[in-house]
């Protein structure tokens, strides 16, 4: 049985092969149960977490993961050497930097060790699965009386990243959004000196070095301008608090990355 999986990570051509045992027509064998889909994310090209939903198994099962790179010098089958656990059941595998080859087709195979014929294989393009760390060291400088320039740094090869800048004043509910290319610099031509502005930035591994869909976390916000006025009824913290979710939380040692985390690690 050959099933095409449409994954949310840009790997629409990924193919999963389910190997089924033969069975009597009146009963279902355990080996017919589909294995959970594996989701892999490469964090800043420092390490990669491949995770699966272990709770989808009918009974707690320590599934095993093997991987290799298709049509390359790294095509030897490797066993996972660093499992991630959820309630003492394997739910992921962490691969270190030396095991990551972004531009070779990554093949990942999940297997039920109690039913070796029950296995599923996926092929992934890792360059589409990179999530950079949040931009850092946001700085603002005045270019003229009404013009501001925002700069930031990334702990990554800057030319590989595109950026999204959002800003708003204290009176705004919505953000104004501006795409920025690899130059990691943004100018706001007209600033109202009576208002307090908040800026934040996130980055994505796209389009020059890959086609990733997932953005980094938002940077710490940075503020500019007046933070108090008689007319303004709102309360403000003078400085941005420490980032509430650390980068270690986004995929650190022994940390299971859930899809929910990936979609909701954003500050408002």
């Amino acid at each position: 049985l050959n099933t095409t999986i449409l994954t949310p990570n840009g790997n629409e051509d990924a193919t999963t092969d389910f190997f089924l045992t033969s069975m009597p027509t009146d009963s279902l064998s355990v080996s017919t149960l589909p294995l959970p889909e594996v989701q892999c994310f490469v964090f800043n090209v420092e390490y990669m977490n491949c995770t699966w939903n272990s709770s989808s198994e009918p009974q707690p099962t320590n599934l095993t993961l093997h991987y290799w790179y298709k049509n390359s010098d790294n095509d030897k089958v490797q066993k996972c050497s660093h499992y991630l656990f959820s309630e003492e059941i394997t739910s992921g595998c962490q691969l270190q930097k030396k095991e990551i080859h972004l531009y070779q087709t990554f093949v990942v195979q999940l297997q039920d060790p109690r039913e070796p014929r029950r296995q599923a294989t996926q092929m992934l393009k890792l360059q589409n699965l990179v999530i950079p760390w949040a931009p850092e060291n946001l700085t603002l400088r005045k270019l003229s009386e009404s013009q501001l320039e925002l700069n930031w740094n990334n702990r990554f090869l800057n030319h590989c990243l595109e950026h999204l800048v959002q800003y708003r004043t204290d009176w705004d509910h919505s953000w104004t959004e501006q795409s920025v290319d690899y130059r990691h610099k943004f100018s706001l031509p007209s600033v109202d000196g009576q208002k307090r502005y908040t800026f934040r930035v996130r980055s994505r591994f796209n389009p020059l070095c890959g086609s990733a869909q997932h953005w980094s976390e938002w940077s710490h916000p940075i503020h500019w301008g007046s933070n108090s006025s008689k007319e303004n009824p709102f309360l403000f913290a003078l400085e941005a608090e420490q980032k509430l979710i650390s980068e270690e939380d986004l995929g650190g040692e022994q940390k299971l990355i859930s899809e929910e985390d990936l979609h909701h690690h954003h500050h408002h």
């Epitope: 959002q166 204290d170 509910h173 919505s174 709102f234 309360l235 913290a237 509430l244 408002h268």
Partner: antibody, heavy 120, light 107 residues
């Protein structure tokens, strides 16, 4: 999946106080702005108050300013609305709502509501 | 404050009808507008944001348009489950405001 559950509503006399809570689950509460919206019986929706993800900014409708206080406890995934000096016109179903992670930040998830009745 | 005026307040229609609801803003709000649906005894649900962006899971018979001060919500072919109240909301600036609502009833 996102779940918001309001509590603390009830019948209260004019001039008294009430504290509403909204318990959140299924998402990283501490990363999202939250709001209170109310609806008087047979009437439309009225935005009441909002708070940023870290509590650093709070916003109020003119009708409740200086009487209501929005707050949050991110360690307990809970949003609060402290309502003082209640009036008959505060009688309504009170909903808590979560912001969506887009530039426009609409309210993508709502609780089922808790009813507040201000009556002597 | 930005006021939103919705029209009509009530609307009687039949299954299969094309329905249009209008929302006017007292000042320009670009496309900072959302539409919500509310059924009796239930909380509102998000239909459209950014004036025309369909929220995930919302049927394609719903569409939004407009910018500045005039916005419309259109239901191309009214279904039985669409009989409900609809509200616009401006998302531009505080205080946030809702339109007065439009109740869509069965003719």
């Amino acid at each position: 999946q996102v779940q918001l559950v309001e509590s603390g509503g009830g019948v209260v006399q004019p001039g008294r106080s009430l504290r509403l809570s909204c318990a959140a689950s299924g998402f990283n509460f501490r990363n999202f702005g939250m709001h209170w919206v109310r609806q008087a019986p047979g009437k439309g929706l009225e935005w009441v108050a909002g708070i940023l993800y870290d509590g650093s900014s709070k916003y109020y409708a003119d009708s409740v300013k200086d009487r209501f206080t929005i707050s949050r406890d991110n360690s307990k995934n809970t949003l609060f609305l402290q309502m003082n000096s209640l009036r008959a016109e505060d009688t309504a179903m009170y909903y808590c709502a979560k912001e969506e992670d887009t530039a426009m930040v609409p309210f993508d998830s709502w609780g089922p509501g808790t009813l507040v009745t201000v009556s002597s | 404050d930005i006021q939103l005026t919705q029209s009509p307040s009530f609307l009687s229609a039949s299954v299969g009808d094309r329905v249009t609801i209008t929302c006017w803003a007292s000042q320009g709000i670009s496309s900072y507008l959302a539409w919500y649906q509310q059924k009796p005894g239930k909380a509102p649900t998000l239909l459209i944001y950014a004036a025309s962006t369909l929220q995930s899971g919302v049927p394609s018979r719903f569409s939004g348009s407009g910018s500045g001060t005039e916005f419309t919500l259109t239901i191309s072919s009214l279904q039985p489950e669409d009989f409900a109240s609809y509200y616009c909301q401006q998302l531009k600036s505080y205080p946030l405001t809702f339109g007065g609502g439009t109740k869509v009833e069965i003719k």
